[in-house]
């Protein structure tokens, strides 16, 4: 019997009846066995077929068989109800071998030409299965030339049988206080040949409760207890199960904080599995009662191990544990049923005693000494000599523990000295230098330090003076002996002040004229304002209207008098402002250099002379009354004049203060 080509040679070829294409002889039997490589099959088709037709092809036939199975018995030329001719059909071996048998009987009624067929090996697609047949692979089937292989979805591993996918379902640990776990793929059928282990591991003190939910379907047996697939539940105390069948198991209260669930499946079956909802319980802690003026969050029916609550205080109250304030408070329930922290208190915020207000006082509005949340206090300044700056002085104790003004300021109000108060009322007439009375010139400052000079108090810690008067002490401010609150130059009764710093106008050049003859002295302490010590006001923008030619200003000081000595008592003189051109002309003739009088100066005095400031008055204020505010302000600073004080046709020259308001304000705000 001729054989087909041996593998690994190419498997393909032609078969034909004996004598083809001539007629075949009687009593012929020919057999071909074709063999393909493993994983291949044989394909066969006929290009010519002409055999004697007989009932059930009993006479002449071609028989195709693969292994023990007959694939076809063929005869005739075309198929009938009971006989089959190949026609255009293609035939396939079931495995890798195909047997072809040709037989003719002892006679033919007429000549028949037989057959011609072609065959070839082709790859078997093992992944394609007939309807109703079990799939080749559990999950994924991959065909290749000569064979196939199986693979699994994520979470599965290929069983050693190379076809089944076992679930990777062990080692899952559940640590939450409640949760759900189920058989793989639930509610779809669970995988075969799998062994699953699930652990529930809660903190000591918890007890796990298991509830089977929805459906339960695990392969069972009518007589034997769960021989195929089963579910077991193990705790450190006992084992529950095995479970199988279709009935939901009852709730299991494990009384344990650790549970191991084992699920084992065999190689067959189609069941949906199970689902467990687990919860936990523990010894409850005492129900937390919120402290007065506080509330508990979250509110729960009960609090067990690991549950927590926080306390929040109402606005204006703060958390207090013992004597210490807390930023926040959270207590946690412990396994022995106690809270890990004692309940705090919500204590009313206390702003504490209000700070003292320099030159002012504080009054408790809500009640004597009441400093708690929403309490009100009222600051006020010492009347007459101080006034409150910006603020209305009303402060409320707010929730942050600060006394806060109606504008939201947490800083103290400021009591500013009232400026320009004088006991003196000015007369319209001009008369000779007079002795000052107490309170007439409370801004007057006596400056001793090499020479005698004067100045005027600004606010409660600045002195305005002439640059030439303090030039020598500009680098040694502490050498200046500053006295105020006295009329008598040599009196031991005065208020002493000391200089912290001297600021000389940067435009002043010593010994080169008196332009910019202005300076400020910062005192190292604030002075207490009273009827004898009061600051002078700085001129308002509108002040020039009170300083026109012939308007009366007042100069005061302890300078040289007509007798040629420094005055023992503070003296003052009322003098009119002189026309600027007139003054400029008076100082244009020798010995005065041209341009001695500048726009930064103003002149005052009588054309006839006799009323003037003099040496020792330098730095003192030439003051004017602002009739709108009824306050005195400094218009000039005693600067220079003729060699002979009070000389006719000559005038006292004063630094024009209104030109220097920005300079003064900048120095004071910066320092």
């Amino acid at each position: 019997t001729p054989l087909g080509p041996k593998w690994p040679e190419p498997v393909f070829g032609r078969l034909a009846s004996p004598g083809f294409p001539g007629e075949y002889a009687n009593d012929q039997e020919r057999r071909w066995t074709l063999t393909a490589p493993p994983g291949y099959r044989l394909r066969l088709y006929f290009t010519h077929f002409d055999l004697e037709l007989s009932h059930l092809c009993e006479y002449d036939f071609v028989k195709l068989s693969s292994g023990a199975k007959v694939l076809a018995t063929l005869c005739g030329q075309e198929s009938t109800d009971t006989e089959r001719a190949p026609g255009k059909d293609t035939f396939y071996s079931l495995g890798s071998s195909l047997d072809i048998t040709f037989r003719s009987d002892y006679s033919n009624e007429k000549p028949f030409t037989g057959f011609e067929a072609f065959y070839a090996a082709e790859d078997i697609d093992e992944c394609q299965v007939a309807p109703g047949e079990a799939p080749t692979c559990d999950h994924h089937c991959h065909n290749h030339l000569g064979g196939f292989y199986c693979s699994c979805r994520a979470g599965y591993v290929l069983h050693r049988n190379k076809r089944t996918c076992s679930a990777l379902c062990s080692g899952q640990v559940f640590t939450q206080r409640s949760g759900e776990l189920s058989s793989p793929e639930y509610p779809r059928p669970y995988p075969k040949l799998s062994s699953c282990t699930y652990s529930i591991s809660l903190e000591e003190g918890f007890s796990v409760i298991l509830d089977f939910v929805e459906s339960f379907d695990v392969e069972t047996h009518p007589e034997t207890l769960c021989p195929y697939d089963f579910l077991k539940i193990q705790t450190d105390r006992e084992e529950h199960g095995p479970f199988c069948g279709k009935t939901l198991p009852h709730r299991i209260e494990t009384k344990s904080n650790t549970v191991t669930i084992t699920f084992v499946t065999d190689e067959s079956g189609d069941h949906t599995g199970w689902k467990i909802h687990y919860t936990s319980t523990a010894q409850p802690c005492p129900y937390p009662m919120a402290p007065p003026n506080g509330h508990v969050s979250p509110v729960q029916a009960k609090y067990i191990l690991k549950d927590s609550f926080s306390i929040f205080c109402e606005t204006g109250y703060e958390l207090l544990q013992g004597h210490l304030p807390l930023k926040s408070f959270t207590a946690v329930c412990q396994k022995d049923g106690s809270w890990d922290r004692p309940m705090p208190a919500c204590s009313i915020v206390d702003c504490g005693p209000p700070d003292d207000l320099p030159s002012g006082r504080v009054e408790y509005i809500t009640g004597p000494g009441v400093t708690t949340y929403k309490a009100v206090i009222q600051y006020s300044c010492e009347e007459t000599f101080y006034t409150m700056k910006v603020n209305d002085g009303k402060y409320v104790c707010e929730a942050d523990g600060f006394w806060t003004s109606s504008k939201g300021e947490k800083s103290l109000p400021v009591c500013e000295p009232v400026c320009g108060l004088s006991a003196r009322t000015t007369g319209g007439r001009i008369y000779g230098g007079q002795k000052a009375k107490p309170g007439d010139f409370p801004w007057q400052v006596l400056i001793l330090g090499g020479t005698t000079a004067a100045g005027a108090l600004l606010y409660d810690n600045w002195v305005l003076t002439a640059a030439h008067a303090v030039y020598e002490q500009k680098h040694d401010a502490s050498a200046l002996d500053i006295r105020m609150g006295t009329l008598k130059r040599l009196s031991p009764h005065y208020t002493q002040a000391w200089s912290e710093a001297v600021f000389i106008h940067e435009g002043y050049t010593h010994d080169a004229g008196f332009d910019n003859d202005i300076a400020l002295i910062k005192l190292n302490n604030k002075v207490v304002i009273n009827s004898n010590i009061t600051p002078i006001c700085l001129p308002r923008k509108e002040a020039e209207s009170f300083m026109r030619t012939d308007d009366i200003g007042t100069a005061s000081g302890w300078g040289l008098t007509q007798r040629g000595f420094l005055a023992r008592n503070l003296m003052y003189v009322d003098i009119p402002i002189v026309d600027h051109q007139k003054c400029t002309a008076a100082y244009e003739k020798p010995p005065y250099p041209r341009g001695s009088v500048t726009a930064n100066m103003l002149c005052a005095g009588l054309e006839s002379g006799g009323k003037d400031s003099c040496r020792g008055d330098s730095g003192g204020a030439l003051v004017f009354l602002d009739s709108e505010t009824e306050r005195w302000f400094v218009g000039g600073i005693v600067s220079w004049g003729s060699m002979n004080c009070g000389e006719a046709g000559q005038y006292g020259v004063y630094t024009k203060v209104i030109n220097y308001i920005p300079w003064i304000e900048n120095i004071i705000s910066d320092f």
Epitope: H323, P325, V349, D350, G401
Partner: antibody, heavy 122, light 106 residues
């Protein structure tokens, strides 16, 4: 204005008891608003809280010193005191008394004494 | 008991900003306090309850506390700010101080 002033011996022998007193002026120690504390500072080192007392006698101590420390209060004299037993050279320090507020703005040491130097040496 | 960790030193030029940190486990859950101490003087409270400034303390001193770190910031540092700075907190009614940070104004 409240002021605090420490007083006591500047030299203490090893193993003896250090005793200091803090006198409060300008305010009452019995005011319920404050705690009164002791803090020390070894030479060239940082601050260490020793303990605090309330006018009622409630005390709080540093756990590391608790076995050796006693703080007491004498409201009639407006004073509070520190006793530190079994001293060693490691207890050489400047000892400060200080006030901490009990109400809002509480618990910070807002007023301090000028400190007193205690040397432990034989 | 808490341990508060501060850098030993911080240098800053005049007018610049100095930041001093204080670290401790969950310090942000507690209140932080800051004290300034100049040589030979007693400490002075500059910040209490994380961010609050006692009266008389300049606005250039500010505080912040969150997570594990509290910070004292001195903006526009002046020569007079040169000092040792200590952080402090209360842990279960026990006062705890940091080791201190020396601020040098260059």
């Amino acid at each position: 204005q409240v002021q605090l002033q420490e007083s006591g011996p500047g030299l203490v022998k090893p193993s003896e008891t250090l005793s200091l007193t803090c006198t409060v002026s300008g305010g009452s120690i019995s005011s319920g608003e404050y705690f009164w504390g002791w803090i020390r500072q070894p030479p060239g080192k940082g601050l260490e809280w020793i303990g605090s007392i309330y006018y009622s006698g409630s005390t709080y101590y540093n756990p590391s010193l608790k076995s050796r420390v006693t703080i007491s209060v004498d409201t009639s004299k407006n004073q509070f005191s520190l006793k530190l037993s079994s001293v060693t050279a490691a207890d050489t320090a400047v000892y400060y008394c200080a006030r901490s507020l009990k109400a809002a703005r509480r618990d910070a040491f807002d007023i301090w004494g000028q400190g007193t130097t205690v040397t432990v040496s034989s | 008991q808490s341990v508060l960790t501060q850098p030993p030193s911080v240098s800053v030029s005049p007018g610049q900003t100095a930041s001093i940190t204080c670290s401790g486990h969950k310090l942000g859950d507690k209140y932080a306090y800051w004290y300034q101490q100049k040589p030979g003087q007693s400490p002075v409270l500059v910040i209490y309850q994380d961010t609050k400034r006692p009266s008389g303390i300049p606005e250039r001193f500010s505080g912040f506390n969150s997570g594990n770190t509290a910070t004292l910031t001195i903006s526009g540092t002046q020569a007079t700010d040169e000092a040792d700075y200590y952080c402090q907190t209360w842990d279960s009614s026990t006062g705890v101080f940091g080791a201190g940070t020396k601020v040098t104004v260059l």
